[in-house]
C-alpha cells in the first residue's frame, strides 16, 4: 500500500495588489523527509495573518497517477465541507461548502491547489488534501491558525500607575514591562476568538521615570514607553 501522510503544502504567493499573501508552503526538504520516514499522519499547525491570501497545496503526485482529489475542510460550527475532483469523469463535486472565498485555484485537472481569498477569523480550522491512487491514499491533516494583530495602547491612569492593553489579538499577546513593576494582568475573551490583554503596573520607586511596555505576538512585537507623571498623562496607541 502507499505510504499515507504525504505532505499537504501551503504555497507562498507574491503580494497581490494591496493584499499580502501568506507564505504557507512547507519547505520541500521538510516535506520529502517527512515522506521518506513514512510517518503516521501528522497534524501540522500553521499560522496565517488575517486579511492575507493563502494557497494550500497537495503532495506532488502527478494527475496521471490519481483517481480522486478531495479537499476536506472543517471549520468551527459548520458541517464538514468537501470539494472533490474525479479524474475519470473530469467532474467536480462540492458538499456543504458555503464559503465562496475557499475555491480551487484553477481547474482541478490542471492544479489541485486550494485557495483562501482574504483570510478571515472564520477560516480557522482543519484542512486536508486526500489524493486517492490505485495503491492507497496520500493525505496530510492541517490546522490553519488565523492570526489577528492586536491594537496596543499605553497610558497612565493614576499616580505612578500605567496601563498597557493589547486589544483583540489572536492568539492572546504577552505583555512585559521594563523595569518590572507591581503588575496585574487580565484577559478578556471575545466571541470571535480574539483576546484583549490588559496589564496594569504600579511603580513605588521614585527614581523610575520612564517605563516601557513590550507586547509580544505571533504577528510581531511592539514596544511603547511613557513617562510617569505625577498626574495621568497622554495616551499612546499603536498597531503592531
Amino acid at each position: 500500500a502507499a505510504q499515507p501522510n504525504n505532505s499537504l503544502m501551503l504555497q507562498t504567493s507574491k503580494e497581490n495588489h494591496a493584499l499580502a499573501s501568506s507564505s504557507l508552503c512547507m519547505d520541500e526538504k521538510q516535506i520529502t523527509q517527512n515522506y521518506s520516514k513514512v510517518l503516521a499522519e501528522v497534524n501540522t499547525s500553521w499560522p496565517v495573518k488575517m486579511a492575507t491570501n493563502a494557497v494550500l497545496c497537495c503532495p506532488p503526485i502527478a494527475l496521471r497517477n490519481l483517481i480522486i482529489i478531495t479537499w476536506e475542510i472543517i471549520l468551527r460550527g459548520q458541517p464538514s465541507c468537501t470539494k472533490a475532483y474525479k479524474k475519470e469523469t473530469n467532474e467536480t463535486k462540492e458538499t456543504n461548502c458555503t464559503d465562496e472565498r475557499i475555491t480551487w485555484v484553477s481547474r482541478p485537472d490542471q492544479n489541485s491547489d486550494l485557495q483562501i481569498r482574504t483570510v478571515a477569523i472564520t477560516h480557522d480550522g482543519y484542512y486536508r488534501c486526500i489524493m486517492v491512487t490505485p495503491d492507497g491514499n496520500f493525505h496530510r491533516g492541517y490546522h490553519l491558525q488565523v492570526l489577528v494583530t492586536p491594537e496596543v495602547t499605553l497610558f497612565q491612569n493614576r499616580n505612578r500607575t500605567a496601563v498597557c492593553k493589547a486589544v483583540a489579538g489572536k492568539p492572546a499577546a504577552h505583555i512585559s514591562w521594563i523595569p518590572e513593576g507591581d503588575c496585574a494582568t487580565k484577559q478578556e475573551y471575545w466571541s470571535n476568538g480574539t483576546v484583549t490583554v490588559k496589564s496594569t503596573c504600579h511603580w513605588e520607586v521614585h527614581n523610575v521615570s520612564t517605563v516601557t511596555c513590550h507586547v509580544s505576538h505571533l504577528t510581531g512585537n511592539k514596544s511603547l514607553y511613557i513617562e510617569l507623571l505625577p498626574v495621568p498623562g497622554a495616551k499612546k496607541s499603536a498597531k503592531l
Epitope: 502507499a2 504525504n6 503544502m9 501551503l10 504555497q11 507562498t12 508552503c25 512547507m26 520541500e28 526538504k29 520529502t32 515522506y35 497545496c57 497537495c58 503532495p59 506532488p60 503526485i61 502527478a62 496521471r64 497517477n65 483517481i67 475519470e88 492544479n111 489541485s112 491547489d113 491512487t133 490505485p134 495503491d135 496520500f138
Partner: antibody
Framework: QVQLVQSGAEVKKPGASVKVSCKAS????????MHWVRQAPGQGLEWMGY????????NYNEKFKGRVTMTRDTSTSTVYMELSSLRSEDTAVYYC????????????WGQGTLVTVSS | DIVLTQSPASLAVSPGQRATITCRAS??????????MHWYQQKPGQPPKLLIY???NLESGVPARFSGSGSGTDFTLTINPVEANDTANYYC????????FGQGTKVEIK
C-alpha cells in the same frame, strides 16, 4: 522486491515491427504507471511514452505517435511496447521504468532490451 | 514541450574535487512549491539510477556526496567530493508535464 524484467535482444529488418515486453513483480502491477525510454548507441535518453495499467491510459511522445503502441496484460503483470515501420535509427536499447507516486520519479528500471534494425 | 539543456557536455574532475552539472529548462518545472526535476546516473551497460528527486531530495541509498539544488528553470547537481567510481553519464529529467531528459553530461575522473 520490485523487479522489471525485459525480453531479450531483437534483430529486425527495416519496415518490420518489434514488440518488447517488461514483466513486473514485487508490487501491485495495476497501481503504477510504466514508462518506456530508448537510448541509441552513444546517445542520450529519449522518452517514448507511458501506459497506466490501472485504466489502460496511454500518452506518447509526439515523435513516435502513429508508430508506437503500449499495451498491458494484467494476468501476467506485463507491459508491452510495440514499434512499427522500423528504421535503422531505431536501433537502440529500450528500457521500461516504473514511476513512483511521490514526485513522479522513476525509481525502478528494467535491464534494457537491445533492438537492432539492419538490412 | 519543455526542453532541458545540460552543461557542460563533459567534465573531467580529480578525485576529492567538486563536480557541478547544470540543467536549464525552457520553462518552469516548479509548481505548488515543488520542482519536478530529477537527476539520474548511468554507467556503461546499465540502466539509469535515480540519484535526486524533486530537485534536492536524495534517493534512499545514494551517498550524501550527491546533492541537488535549484527551482523554476535552473538546477544543479553537485558531486562533492568526487570518487573514482562516479565515472558515468548524468541526466536531468523533468516530470512537470510530459517527461523529457537533458542530453546528458559525461563525467570522467582524472
Amino acid at each position: 522486491q520490485v523487479q522489471l524484467v525485459q525480453s531479450g535482444a531483437e534483430v529486425k529488418k527495416p519496415g518490420a515491427s518489434v514488440k518488447v515486453s517488461c514483466k513486473a513483480s514485487g508490487y501491485t502491477f495495476t497501481s503504477y504507471v510504466m514508462h518506456w525510454v530508448r537510448q541509441a548507441p552513444g546517445q542520450g535518453l529519449e522518452w517514448m511514452g507511458y501506459i497506466n495499467p490501472y485504466n489502460d491510459d496511454t500518452n506518447y511522445n509526439e515523435k513516435f505517435k502513429g508508430r508506437v503502441t503500449m499495451t498491458r496484460d494484467t494476468s501476467t503483470s506485463t507491459v508491452y511496447m510495440e514499434l512499427s515501420s522500423l528504421r535503422s535509427e531505431d536501433t537502440a536499447v529500450y528500457y521500461c521504468a516504473r514511476e513512483d507516486y511521490y514526485g513522479s520519479r522513476w525509481g525502478y528500471w528494467g535491464q534494457g532490451t537491445l533492438v537492432t534494425v539492419s538490412s | 514541450d519543455i526542453v532541458l539543456t545540460q552543461s557542460p557536455a563533459s567534465l573531467a574532475v580529480s578525485p576529492g574535487q567538486r563536480a557541478t552539472i547544470t540543467c536549464r529548462a525552457s520553462k518552469s518545472v516548479s509548481t505548488s512549491g515543488y520542482s519536478y526535476m530529477h537527476w539520474y546516473q548511468q554507467k556503461p551497460g546499465q540502466p539509469p539510477k535515480l540519484l535526486i528527486y524533486l530537485a534536492s531530495n536524495l534517493e534512499s541509498g545514494v551517498p550524501a556526496r550527491f546533492s541537488g539544488s535549484g527551482s523554476g528553470t535552473d538546477f544543479t547537481l553537485t558531486i562533492n567530493p568526487v570518487e573514482a567510481n562516479d565515472t558515468a553519464n548524468y541526466y536531468c529529467q523533468h516530470s512537470r508535464e510530459l517527461d523529457t531528459f537533458g542530453q546528458g553530461t559525461k563525467v570522467e575522473i582524472k
